[in-house]
Interface confidence: low
């Protein structure tokens, strides 16, 4: 009810001689702060004083006496909610109850507390989950009702008496709901834990010894099972007897069944703990192992790999890899199936043995085309031979081999003709599917590997083909020595290396790129004439009657071909001058008189002088000298000088017979 | 075919301890024991130890009780010796074995298919 002090702490503390009490407690009073506070032993009321009766073992009042044991006891408190206590050291006497006698300035109030000290320290208790399953993991409690921030303790786990290694968490209380000390440890628990001791020990801060509790673990496990075999190798023959024995070593709960395993599947009616096996074959050969079940489930044993040995199978060649390419490895492995296994082996290449090779495996470094074939093998071993089984086949690709070039027509070609050629190769694996040219030209291809060069050039040296399947090979390059006539025929002037004067030593020469076959004639030609078959003309001194056009002719075998015809210029002076008079050499005065200075000259005459019969040159410089009108004074002989770059030449005298007219005559 | 191959071997004082390893590859679905052995020089191949490929069972030669323990590591497919208290007379080339098929006597060496190639422990005094 209202009239009521309202506290909080736990109902009973817990403890042992030497040790101490820490009293968690909080208070609200009726009416204002505390004023007097007392802590009694034991208290009694007595009616006839109306006083609690005790051992007073704290005393706060206002006149502030304290009695010695205050300094054992303390109250932790305050004045209005704090009513916390600490006893340090406790003592065996102090068991029994405690008083809190409290006053405020109107209302009183006794609260009680038990205190139980024991003489020596308490054990913790171990609590365990109500079933430990192997390889489950489970959390252990170690519990102590006790904790006091002035006497630290420490809970250890052991196991055997041996510390565990899983790391326990330690956690303690001192509320006013509660005060303990607690230890969790998580641990997977083995089979073989299964009746171990296990201990939680309470120790002080120094890890001396004060008290413990011990539980035995019971571990639920499956069935563990050990499995003998006689022979003890398991190694027989086929009609030989076999007995395998199953032995439990640990079971928790009981065990309930007993089966045979081989492979992991059941035998049926093998439901003892003896599996007795008469006159094996080797089908009976496999992983035998027994199968106990308990009601946490079933355990097996090791698997024991009972061999029934027999001679080797017919075997079989496996081959890595074929289609072989030439010049790669392979690796051919002959299976057969033989317990024990084979130890020997024989090889055979096309039905012949290979001497030398008895392993499993036979490997060829380095693949050649006669490799090819059909490999087989034979198995033996300590029981017998094997069968040879119907072996694999090897097949070598390589690329063709000794490929060629050939020429197919009859010899020489001659530039023009119509060229035939085969490619041609010795053996090829796979099949060759396809041919190629070198160089490559607009030529035709009749057929596979054949190829056809219409009107074959005189340049067309050499011709190559590759024959391919999955790669190419390529031929030697074959030459073919094309003939013609001989090409870029042309004359060419070796002296003088100037312009040809009169008189000049003068030596053409007929010159030609190339001609096959080498040898050659020559031929001079002039206005079609035969001039000479050298390859030089030579004029020791040309005269103007030699200038004119020249061709040179090249002959071989195959034909002959014509140079450019090339002009012979020969310079020199005028000469043959003559003066020609028009109209005639006899003109009637008052006339007109044309004399012209006629010259034959190389280059052209390009400056020409007049002079009379007096030798005096005239102030005219054209070919033609025109006199109009003409008069008697101009009668006598005239003559002219021509003059190119080559020199001057003069022509002989030409009389000019000027006559009177009739109409002078009639005057006279 | 399953390959072996020791490591771990070496100098040590006695009183010291090694640890040696076994590294299987190949068909390791077909081990089920794996043992280890030693050769003194002069000395026949003896027995030191083997576990079961579940883990389940181990045996180990009464001169090693105590000293040595075998312990597995499915996920490398290696198992490990390790050796504590070394003494002069555990000097040897240590062998590590297979067994393909699971025999129960597992100290009989000419049981055992595979065999590493061995690694040399000496102990000094």
């Known amino acids: 009810d209202s009239s009521k002090w309202v506290f909080e702490h736990p109902e009973t503390l817990y403890a042992w001689e030497g040790a101490c009490v820490w009293i968690p407690c909080t208070y609200r009073a009726l009416d204002g702060d505390l004023e007097s506070f007392i802590l009694f032993h034991n208290p009694e009321y007595n009616k006839n004083t109306s006083k609690f009766d005790g051992t007073r073992l704290y005393e706060s009042t206002k006149d502030g006496k304290v009695p010695s044991e205050q300094k054992r006891v303390q109250f932790l408190g305050d004045k209005n909610k704090n009513c916390t206590l600490s006893i340090h050291p406790v003592h065996l006497n102090d068991s029994g109850q405690l008083g809190l006698r409290m006053e405020s300035k109107t209302e009183k109030w006794m609260e009680r507390i038990h205190l139980n000290v024991s003489e020596r320290p308490f054990p913790p208790h171990i609590q365990l989950p109500p079933e430990i399953q192997e390889s489950q993991e489970v959390t252990l409690t170690c519990l102590l009702n006790f904790s006091c921030y002035g006497y630290p303790i420490q809970l250890q786990w052991l196991l055997e008496g041996v510390p565990m290694r899983q790391a326990a968490v330690t956690s303690t209380s001192l509320t006013i709901k509660s005060v303990f000390t607690r230890s969790e440890l998580k641990f997977s628990p083995q089979w073989s834990h299964h009746g171990k001791i296990v201990t939680c020990q309470l120790q002080d801060a120094d890890g001396k010894f004060l008290s413990n509790d011990t539980v035995q673990l019971n571990v639920k496990h499956t069935p563990k099972l050990e499995i003998k075999v006689t022979p003890s190798d398991a190694i027989v023959r086929e009609g030989d007897s076999v007995t395998m024995t199953c032995e439990v070593s640990s079971s928790n709960p009981e065990y309930t069944t007993v089966s045979w395993l081989k492979d992991g599947t059941s035998l049926k009616k093998q439901n003892t703990f003896t599996l007795n096996l008469r006159e094996v074959t080797k089908d009976q050969s496999g992983k035998y192992c027994c199968q106990v079940s308990n009601d946490v489930g079933p355990g097996r044993s090791e698997e024991v790999f009972l061999q029934v040995q027999y001679a080797p199978e017919p075997s079989t060649v496996q081959i890595l890899h074929s289609p072989a390419v030439e010049g790669s490895q392979v690796e051919f492995l002959c299976m057969s199936l033989a317990n024990p296994l084979p130890t020997n082996y024989t090889w055979y290449h096309n039905g012949k043995e290979m001497q030398g090779r008895t392993e499993e495996k036979v490997h060829i470094p380095k693949i050649l085309p006669w490799h090819a074939g059909t490999y087989s093998c034979v198995a033996e071993n300590i029981l017998g031979t094997g069968q040879r089984g119907p072996g694999a086949e090897l097949d070598v690709q390589y690329p063709p081999k000794k490929v060629t070039t050939v020429i197919q027509n009859p010899m020489p070609i001659r530039e023009g003709d119509t060229v035939t050629l085969s490619c041609n190769y010795n053996s090829s694996n796979p099949s060759v599917t396809r041919y190629e040219w070198k160089p490559h030209g607009a030529w035709e291809e009749p057929s596979l590997g054949v190829l056809k060069i219409q009107n074959v050039g005189w340049d067309n040296t050499t011709i190559a083909c590759a024959a391919c399947n999955s790669w190419c090979s390529w031929a030697s390059p074959v030459a073919l020595n094309v003939q013609y006539a001989p090409r870029d025929v042309r004359v060419r002037k070796i002296k003088p290396l100037s312009e040809i004067h009169s008189g000049n030593s003068v030596s053409l020469q007929c010159d030609f790129s190339s001609s096959h076959p080498k040898e050659v004639q020559f031929f001079w030609e002039k206005n079609g004439r035969l001039l000479g078959k050298e390859s030089q003309l030579n004029f020791d001194s040309i005269s103007p009657e030699d200038a004119g056009s020249y061709s040179c002719w090249v002959n071989n075998s195959i034909g002959q071909t014509a140079s450019k015809a090339w002009t012979l210029e020969v310079l020199y002076a005028p000469r043959r001058l003559r003066v020609s008079m028009s109209p005639g050499d006899q003109v009637m005065e008052g006339k007109s008189a044309t004399l012209t200075c006629e010259s034959d000259a190389n280059p052209p005459v390009s400056h020409y002088t007049w002079f009379d019969w007096n030798n005096q040159s005239l102030p005219y410089h054209s070919q033609k000298l025109r006199l109009e009108p003409v008069k008697v004074q101009h009668s006598g002989a005239y003559w002219c000088q021509g003059t190119n770059s080559v020199g001057k030449g003069r022509s002989p005298l030409s009389t000019l017979t000027v006559y009177y007219s009739p109409e002078t005559i009639g005057r006279r | 075919q399953v390959q072996l191959v020791e490591s771990g071997g070496g100098l040590v004082q006695a009183g010291g301890s090694l640890r040696l390893a076994c590294a299987a590859s190949?068909?390791?679905?077909?081990?089920?024991?794996m043992g280890w052995f030693r050769q003194a020089p002069g000395k026949e191949r003896e027995f030191v130890g083997a576990?079961?490929?579940?883990?389940?069972?181990?045996d180990h030669a009464d001169s090693v009780k105590g000293r040595f323990t075998i312990s597995r590591d499915d996920a490398q497919n290696t198992v490990f010796l390790h050796m504590n208290d070394l003494k002069p007379e555990d000097t040897a080339v240590y062998y590590c074995?297979?067994?393909?098929?699971?025999?129960?006597?597992?100290?009989?060496?000419?049981?055992?298919?595979?065999w590493g190639q061995g690694t040399q422990v000496t102990v000094s005094s």
């Open positions: 074995a297979v067994q393909r098929y699971g025999w129960v006597y597992r100290t009989d060496k000419t049981m055992y298919n595979y």
């Open positions: 190949g068909d390791t679905v077909s081990i089920y024991y």
């Open positions: 576990l079961s490929a579940s883990g389940q069972f181990t």
